[in-house]
């Protein structure tokens, strides 16, 4: 039963969330955002659709995730890029694709890159093309920190809930 | 000592798992599956071999992971694909490689893609070739949900415990 | 307030870490290492710089992470490789790039690959080039286990805190 073996206040919390089990008795901040497919030339994160969610204090403001409490968080993101048949014109030079998760903190007056992935694709040599990038890691974050992303190659994003996403959860 | 500072029932749980420490006092559902290397033209997940495991209620049925309790889970998977040395039959047509983690739930009458990665490789252009795909994210899952994978390019999988795997753990 | 609703010894622990909240009340072993950018032809992991850290018993010895307590850990790593601008000397021979997280345990007299990613790049065909590799998964580890990495293509690493990293955390 929910609350069995918990101290009174923890049991009360569990009763308020009847689906919880002992293994899940202390909720933790977590968020999973997806890229808005209706915005083709920008990457706008959405939390109120499909499988996306904000839990336990995480909020989305100015396209950034706001860290609710200090602690260690696992932060992750994925993008998928594609090029339709023969999109480049007079060049065989590669297309630079990159995706970065950045931290803006009261401790620093600039965006600090936390996670970066990069790729050169050669559209003139290989069309159509598809490329996926994923990264994630654990970081010590402070309440109020802002997590955002920067992407080179936004017009080439394959925007769907399972291909372009950004999230974090407290450890 | 295991169980110190825990309420009676939690201490009992800890005593039953003597290796546990306070930091690990509440076991959580977790699973890590590996692709069966003896099955070359299919991707069958195995839990009873190498580093693979099922813990705290996770089970494997019909090649799907069954979610034991409702909550937020981090779900992940990787595949590695390869193409052997140049074959005269290779053309300049691209080979579509994709790997997807899917959710089948009582809430939906179809498989919902949770994580998707895709790649085009050009065997005639680059032989031999190798490509890795990884993805993972946090999802709100319900007891009884089924997590499965779908892969395009199965004959090209490099099936080993460290290259092809699928897992999840409760947060 | 920290410690509210916790048993006495857990409350004492929380008071010693005043920034902690209920959701974070039991610290767990965690580590995040970054590749030393001053070492161009080797991959040396560093914990005392940038966003890197060792927490709750994790230590770094002989370029390996030492597992502090037995349990399930999520282990991850990323590398980014690059090839500089076009050189006429470049041939069409492929360059083999690979990154592996390995386990050395008292249970086995050899390094066991846990996570492996691989790629062939063709420098003569596509210059400049960039490629990212990421992987992570959950493993049952034992106190004293050593986690290390092996990389093919070290001279091509893009060594920065956000591109080359290695970490783990207890679940």
């Amino acid at each position: 039963l929910p609350g069995v073996g918990l101290t009174p206040s923890a049991a009360q919390t569990a009763r308020q969330h009847p689906k919880m089990h002992l293994a899940h008795s202390t909720l933790k901040p977590a968020a999973h955002l997806i890229g808005d497919p209706s915005k083709q030339n920008s990457l706008l994160w959405r939390a109120n659709t499909d499988r996306a969610f904000l839990q336990d204090g995480f909020s989305l403001s100015n396209n950034s995730l706001l860290v609710p409490t200090s602690g260690i968080y696992f932060v992750y993101s994925q993008v998928v890029f594609s090029g339709k048949a023969y999109s480049p014109k007079a060049t065989s030079s590669p297309l630079y694709l990159a995706h970065e998760v950045q931290l803006f903190s009261s401790q620093y007056p600039f965006h600090v890159p936390l996670l970066s992935s990069q790729k050169m694709v050669y559209p003139g040599l290989q069309e159509p093309w598809l490329h996926s990038m994923y990264h994630g890691a654990a970081f010590q974050l402070t309440q109020g920190d802002q997590l955002s992303t920067h992407t080179d190659g936004i017009p080439h994003l394959v925007l769907s809930p399972s291909t372009v996403f950004f999230g974090a959860f407290a450890l | 000592l295991p169980g110190v500072g825990l309420t009676p029932s939690a201490a009992q749980t800890a005593r039953q798992h003597p290796k546990m420490h306070l930091a690990h006092s509440t076991l959580k559902p977790a699973a890590h599956l590996i692709g069966d290397p003896s099955k070359q033209n299919s991707l069958l997940w195995r839990a009873n071999t190498d580093r693979a495991f099922l813990q705290d209620g996770f089970s494997l049925s019909n090649n799907s992971l069954l979610v034991p309790t409702s909550g937020i889970y981090f779900v992940y998977s990787q595949v590695v694909f390869s193409g052997k040395a140049y074959s005269p039959k290779a053309t300049s047509s691209p080979l579509y490689l994709a790997h997807e983690v899917q959710l089948f739930s009582s809430q939906y009458p179809f498989h919902v893609p949770l994580l998707s990665s895709q790649k085009m490789v050009y065997p005639g252009l680059q032989e031999p070739w190798l490509h890795s795909m990884y993805h993972g994210a946090a999802f709100q899952l319900t007891q009884g949900d089924q997590l499965s994978t779908h892969t395009d390019g199965i004959p090209h999988l490099v099936l080993s415990p460290s290259t092809v795997f699928f897992g999840a753990f409760a947060l | 307030l920290p410690g509210v609703g916790l048993t006495p010894s857990a409350a004492q622990t929380a008071r010693q870490h005043p920034k902690m909240h209920l959701a974070h009340s039991t610290l767990k072993p965690a580590a995040h290492l970054i590749g030393d950018p001053s070492k161009q032809n080797s991959l040396l992991w560093r914990a005392n710089t940038d966003r890197a850290f060792l927490q709750d018993g994790f230590s770094l010895s002989n370029n390996s992470l030492l597992v502090p307590t037995s349990g399930i850990y999520f282990v991850y790593s990323q590398v980014v490789f690059s090839g500089k601008a076009y050189s006429p000397k470049a041939t069409s021979s492929p360059l083999y790039l690979a990154h592996e997280v390995q386990l050395f345990s008292s249970q086995y007299p050899f390094h066991v690959p846990l996570l492996s990613s691989q790629k062939m790049v063709y420098p003569g065909l596509q210059e400049p080039w960039l490629h990212s590799m990421y992987h992570g998964a959950a493993f049952q580890l034992t106190q004293g286990d050593q986690l290390s990495t092996h990389t093919d293509g070290i001279p091509h690493l893009v060594l920065s805190p956000s591109t080359v990293f290695f970490g783990a955390f207890a679940l």
Partner: antibody, heavy 115, light 113 residues
């Protein structure tokens, strides 16, 4: 529809250096290479080289190494070419930036080197 | 470096006439894997910057009138204007983007009689 807008004409002394800018508008240019092309009066087109604004990678025509240096500022969507040790006859020309991926060309910047 | 040679260097035609100009490369611009020729044609009108007309040897850029046609493969390429108009007065350049450095032909100057 994107376009490339170049800085205005320059009159420089021999031996000096000049920096010409090329601002991309209507699209984000970081993923696409910006090429630089030189055209002397009565001459054809010469390819100087290119820069990837996102990665910072560059490719130079050997004939312009040491003469031209490319930079880019992603935040302002602007690429630059710096020409050093200017000489009267060799460097006086119209300099164009171009994005071959989309087929965009700037309007050109006239550089006159005269004592 | 790949050398691009254009001919003739200039020609004068009347409005409505058909024009062809040639571009030859010192090595093949055909990429065998995708069967594409890495060649572009540009039009430069007096006092203006070059404008892309044709890429991949035969693909017209958007907005380019269909009287302009690119053809050829390997080392020999042709730009044809089926019925010249007065506004076609310009210098036409071919460019290879098969290898570095990119190189241009010397141009063909089209004059209207």
């Amino acid at each position: 529809q994107g376009q490339l807008q170049q800085s205005g004409a320059e009159l420089m002394k021999p031996g000096a250096s000049v920096k010409i800018s090329c601002k991309a508008t209507g699209y984000t240019f970081s993923s696409y290479w910006i090429e630089w092309v030189k055209q002397r009066p009565g001459h054809g087109l010469e390819w100087i080289g290119e820069i990837s604004p996102g990665s910072g990678s560059t490719n130079y025509n050997e004939e312009f190494k040491g003469k031209a240096t490319f930079t880019a500022d992603k935040s302002s969507n602007t690429a630059y070419i710096q020409l050093s040790s200017l000489s009267t006859s060799e460097d006086s020309a119209v300099y164009y930036c171009a994005d071959g991926y989309h087929g965009y060309w700037g309007q050109g910047t006239t550089l006159t080197v005269s004592s | 470096d790949i050398v691009m040679s254009q001919s003739p260097s200039s020609l004068a035609v009347s409005v409505g006439e058909k024009v062809t100009m040639s571009c030859k490369s010192s090595q093949s611009l055909l990429y065998s894997t995708n069967q594409k020729n890495f060649l572009a044609w540009y039009q430069q009108k007096p006092g203006q910057s070059p404008k892309l007309l044709i890429y991949w040897a035969s693909t017209r850029d958007s907005g380019v009138p269909d009287r302009f046609t690119g053809s050829g493969s390997g080392t020999d390429f042709t730009l044809t204007i089926s019925s010249v108009k007065a506004e076609d007065l310009a210098v036409y350049y071919c460019q290879q983007y098969y290898s570095y450095p990119r190189t241009f032909g010397g141009g063909t100057k089209l004059e209207i009689k």
